[in-house]
């Protein structure tokens, strides 16, 4: 037999979860023990069962899971997991503030990503950061040539996505950029988007040709310009 | 073709629970983040709320909150909006808009395609 | 929230006349991507709104070149060069940037 214990502690250590009105809010307290424990949440020290929140909780037991859509401010709280078995108990705290600030357009860092010079054959990260009230998600552009275009009959310019991802709000998203040659040069766009609309910067890479062996010593391999 | 089409509206009384739905076809519904506008008659637009791409963030007018619920099931393409606690203020037609896509757009990023509007009455 | 203001509330038009409408928005709607989030749509009688300007100055597919936005970032307008018997209707400026949306109180354009 065995008392109950934390299976996954690291996937516990945000305590404080500040998230936008209107988000969707899940606590996981995954444990184990022998006989398996049971869990059950408590919010502010009472029994929470949900049955005074509009629209409910959902109690997903097998992942140890509470679930809250479309939190607003009665939510904030402490929610505390309790699991126990016939041999002990163990308890963890999240609190919850929600955030009443209109949700915006993403916001992205003045002068990122920078515009960029680099030697064929090296790397480079270009950099975007994000941020934005509602959970952002994020694209990355190059502007390509089409028939010796850059913009199509109806005036907008050619793209290709070169990565899509979600993120948490105000992360660096880096695109890597590896053994560079001459054809990676051009326009790169990050695009960050959420509900209420989408927001783009641009930077410029430059590939210079491999630089000549007597003087590359001098020279550092790849150069960052605003 | 693109085409928001709502369903759903009618005579109600205030206190009452009247349900909006909204189809859409024509474009890829999961990648796109909805919106519900409503206009009073012989008055001007009023934003309801948003949802976004995937239903994970919702956000609502003050006049709304905690009344209405905005949903979607993008396996069906289908936008809803659940109206409890109606009052005579809430008078008016319901419009769906599709909102900001998920990815880059040509043109505006959203607020471009608006249903034909269903007309709700709240009425004692 | 941002308030949108329009005026005129009427604006009695001759057709091939030129016509002009004005929005001042509470708070600037220029965002940092260096955009301005501002839409100019017209309502037609018993229709839906539909799309003319969006960020400012663009005009929306299918838009005839008589329409065009400009402005700053509070203030903006939308010009009609020569208007037509169809451009009746009312017109409604929208910010565009931040939850809640909120639209100006419209300009009824009729036919004089």
């Known amino acids: 037999q065995q008392a109950p214990y934390w299976t996954h502690p690291q996937r516990m250590e945000k305590k404080l979860h500040a998230v936008p009105a209107g988000n969707t809010v899940k606590f996981r307290c995954p444990a184990a023990g022998n006989p398996t424990p049971t869990i059950r949440w408590l919010k502010d020290g009472q029994a929470f069962h949900g049955e005074n929140r509009i629209g409910g909780i959902r109690l997903r037991h097998q992942h140890w899971s509470l679930v809250m859509e479309s939190v607003v401010p009665s939510d904030r709280g402490t929610y505390t997991c309790l699991v126990e078995n016939a041999v002990g108990s163990i308890r963890y705290n999240y609190l919850l503030d929600v955030l009443e600030r209109s949700p915006h357009r993403p916001i992205l860092q003045a002068g990122l990503p920078a515009n960029t010079t680099a030697v064929v054959g090296s790397d480079v990260e270009l950099l975007c950061k994000v941020y934005s009230d509602a959970q952002p998600h994020i694209q990355w552009l190059k502007h390509i040539v089409i028939n010796g275009s850059s913009f199509g009959a109806d005036g907008f310019p050619y793209v290709q996505v070169l990565k899509t991802a979600d993120i948490n709000s105000s992360e660096v998203e880096v695109l890597y950029l590896r053994n560079v040659s001459a054809e990676d040069a051009g326009e790169y766009t990050c695009l960050a988007g959420n509900s209420i609309g989408l927001s783009y910067q641009s930077a410029w890479l430059t590939v210079l040709p491999e630089e000549d062996p007597t003087w590359t010593a001098a020279a550092p391999e790849a150069r960052y310009t605003d | 073709e693109v085409q928001l089409l709502e369903s759903g509206g009618g005579v109600v009384q205030p206190g009452r629970s009247l349900r909006l739905s909204c189809a859409a076809s024509?474009?890829?519904?999961?990648?796109?983040?909805m919106h519900w506008v409503r206009q009073a008659p012989g008055k001007g637009l009023e934003w309801v709320a948003v949802?976004?791409?995937?239903?994970?963030?919702?956000y609502y007018a003050d006049s709304v909150k905690g009344r209405f619920t905005i949903s979607r099931d993008n396996s069906k393409n289908t936008l809803s909006l659940q109206m409890n606690s109606l009052r005579v203020e809430d008078t008016a037609i319901y419009y769906c808009v599709r909102g900001a896509g998920r990815g880059y757009t040509y043109g505006p990023d959203g607020f471009d395609i608006w249903g034909q509007g269903t007309m709700v009455t709240v009425s004692s | 929230d941002i308030v949108m203001t329009q005026s005129p509330l009427s604006l009695p038009v001759t057709p091939g006349e030129p016509a002009s409408i004005s929005c001042t928005s509470s708070?600037?709607?220029?965002?940092?991507?260096?955009?301005?989030?501002v839409y100019w749509y017209l309502q037609k009688p018993g229709q839906s709104p539909q799309v003319l300007i969006y960020e400012l100055s663009n005009r929306f597919s299918g838009v005839p070149d008589r329409f065009s936005g400009s402005g700053s970032g509070t203030d903006f307008t939308l010009k009609i060069s020569r208007v037509e018997a169809e451009d009746v209707g009312v017109y409604y400026c929208m910010q565009y940037i931040e939850a809640p949306l909120t639209f100006g109180g419209g300009t009824k354009v009729e036919i004089k």
């Open positions: 708070r600037s709607l220029l965002h940092s991507d260096g955009k301005t989030y």
């Open positions: 024509g474009f890829t519904f999961s990648s796109y983040a």
């Open positions: 949802i976004s791409y995937d239903g994970s963030n919702k």
